[in-house]
């Protein structure tokens, strides 16, 4: 005859083999995850007496030393957590839940999607056009995404002897700031106490070993008595432009 024991919600649960308590959370068996991300597998289970959970990788006991940085098991959440996954983490992960009455298991397949090297990507809408009065300060921001080390340059078109282009037809350019040992926060170009001469186009140019990307913004400098027209506020967009 079945025996009973008291569980936390004070209802009597018959003793027996483990069972899944939330199969919806387990429906997605194939997980494709970008490298360097955190992966979490859950196998919520119940059972009386309380079940224990073990994890296998490719059918064998999954030990901490099997991956750099190890992994975390949260028994109260029935979960396995692997941080900063790498290609060698690919494989089948099986949760094995057992008590004295029996065992159940569920297998997930992890595919680590390797990054593809690419030229820098700049966030859309940045840098944003700005306006200020003579003597004012202004800041341009360039948000860069690049797996490889990016080299950031802030460039402005300038005039020489009243000419915008050189004898070769190419525009005169001045590098105002670039990333390097002596340059902190290269993604931001700050201009202080601006004059009418500072008005014009500012280019954020970013390169890595693969290629380049650039985006530009315009600075309007108004006479002191004229208050600046507020630019429409830019909200960070999840979209990126190459």
């Amino acid at each position: 005859r079945p025996s009973f024991s008291l569980v936390e919600d004070t209802t009597l649960e018959p003793e027996g083999a483990p069972y899944w308590t939330n199969t919806e959370k387990m429906e997605k068996r194939l997980h494709a995850c970008p490298a360097a991300n955190t992966v979490k597998f859950r196998c919520p289970a119940g059972g009386n007496p309380t079940s224990t959970m073990r994890w296998l990788k490719n059918g064998k006991e999954f030990k901490q030393e099997h991956r750099i940085g190890g992994y975390k098991v949260r028994n109260q959440h029935w979960s396995l957590i692997m941080e900063s996954v790498v290609p060698s983490d690919k494989g089948n992960y099986t949760c094995l839940v057992e008590n004295e009455y029996g065992s159940i298991n569920h297998t997930y397949h992890l595919d680590v999607v390797e990054r593809s090297p690419h030229r820098p990507i700049l966030q859309a809408g940045l840098p944003a056009n700005a306006s200020t009065v003579v003597g004012g300060d202004v800041e341009f921001v360039c948000k860069v995404y690049s797996d490889a080390q990016p080299h950031i340059q802030w460039i402005k078109h300038v005039e020489k002897n009243g000419s915008k282009n050189g004898p070769d037809g190419l525009p005169y350019l001045k590098v105002l700031k670039h990333s390097g040992i002596n340059s902190s926060n290269a993604e931001v170009l700050a201009l202080f106490n601006v004059t009418e001469m500072d008005a014009g186009e500012y280019i954020c140019k970013v390169s890595n070993y693969i290629g380049q990307a650039n985006q530009s913004a315009w600075l309007t400098v108004l006479p002191k008595q004229q208050a600046p027209v507020r630019e429409k506020e830019i909200t960070a967009s999840p979209d990126y432009l190459e």
Epitope: P87, H118, Y209, I210
Partner: antibody, heavy 114, light 107 residues
Framework: QVQLQQPGAEVVKPGASVKMSCKAS????????VHWVKQTPGQGLEWIGS????????SYNQNFKGKATLTADKSSSTAYIQLSSLTSEDSAVYYC???????WGQGTLVTVSV | NIVMTQSPKSMSMSVGDRVSITCKAS??????VAWYQKKPGQSPKLLIY???YRYTGVPDRFTGSGSGTDFTFTISNVQAEDLAVYYC?????????FGGGTKLEIK
């Protein structure tokens, strides 16, 4: 598929110049750097420099400044390297490679001899 | 210039052996390191990029690891066709520099 085509060999006299080509196909030529790499039996692999065909921006290894000039022709998707004042030290295989170094030309063997 | 010191210069291994090659950068290069295989008469072939990412189609016996200044390239189960020279390269800062190469010979 991505391809970088280079001539097989060039024989040149000391003091002369040579201009080698690297014709790209199978990808958007203007969106990747083109790198040039020198290989000699004694020195292994040496990065000469790169060009970004979209705007012609170049970056050189200081060791090759004045020796190598990189150019690119967008209309024909071809990158070029010109080597000047050649000496026996310049005898080597010269490779072009796409920006990500995932695709390489077959290399051009340059022989400097009288 | 960043110097990439690669060792050993050469090694002789048997089929099935595990091979490890190290590369030390003279200054930090984050994870901007690639590994190439160079066979005689062929152009270099990209195996690993960003220190640990296997390039498309590269067999999983080839692995890379490391960050900062110390990097390791491993072939876990050497095959006869792995006979080649292997190079590391940093692509963090110009000039992009290569290691001196490691010649792998098969016994």
């Amino acid at each position: 598929q991505v391809q970088l085509q280079q001539p097989g060999a060039e024989v040149v006299k000391p003091g002369a110049s040579v201009k080698m080509s690297c014709k790209a196909s199978g990808y958007i030529f203007t969106t990747y750097n083109v790198h040039w790499v020198k290989q000699t039996p004694g020195q292994g692999l040496e990065w000469i420099g790169s060009i970004y065909p979209d705007n012609g921006d170049t970056s050189y290894n200081q060791n090759f400044k004045g020796k190598a000039t990189l150019t690119a022709d967008k209309s024909s998707s071809t990158a070029y390297i010109q080597l000047s004042s050649l000496t026996s030290e310049d005898s080597a295989v010269y490779y072009c490679a796409r920006g990500d170094f995932a695709y390489w030309g077959q290399g051009t063997l340059v022989t400097v001899s009288v | 210039n960043i110097v990439m010191t690669q060792s050993p210069k050469s090694m002789s291994m048997s089929v099935g052996d595990r091979v490890s090659i190290t590369c030390k950068a003279s200054q930090g290069v984050s994870n901007d390191v690639a590994w190439y295989q160079k066979k005689p008469g062929q152009s270099p072939k990209l195996l690993i990029y960003s220190a640990s990412y296997r390039y498309t189609g590269v067999p999983d016996r080839f692995t890379g690891s490391g960050s900062g200044t110390d990097f390791t390239f491993t072939i876990s189960n050497v095959q006869a066709e792995d006979l080649a020279v292997y190079y590391c390269q940093q692509h963090s800062t110009t000039p992009y520099t290569f290691g001196g190469g490691t010649k792998l010979e098969i016994k």
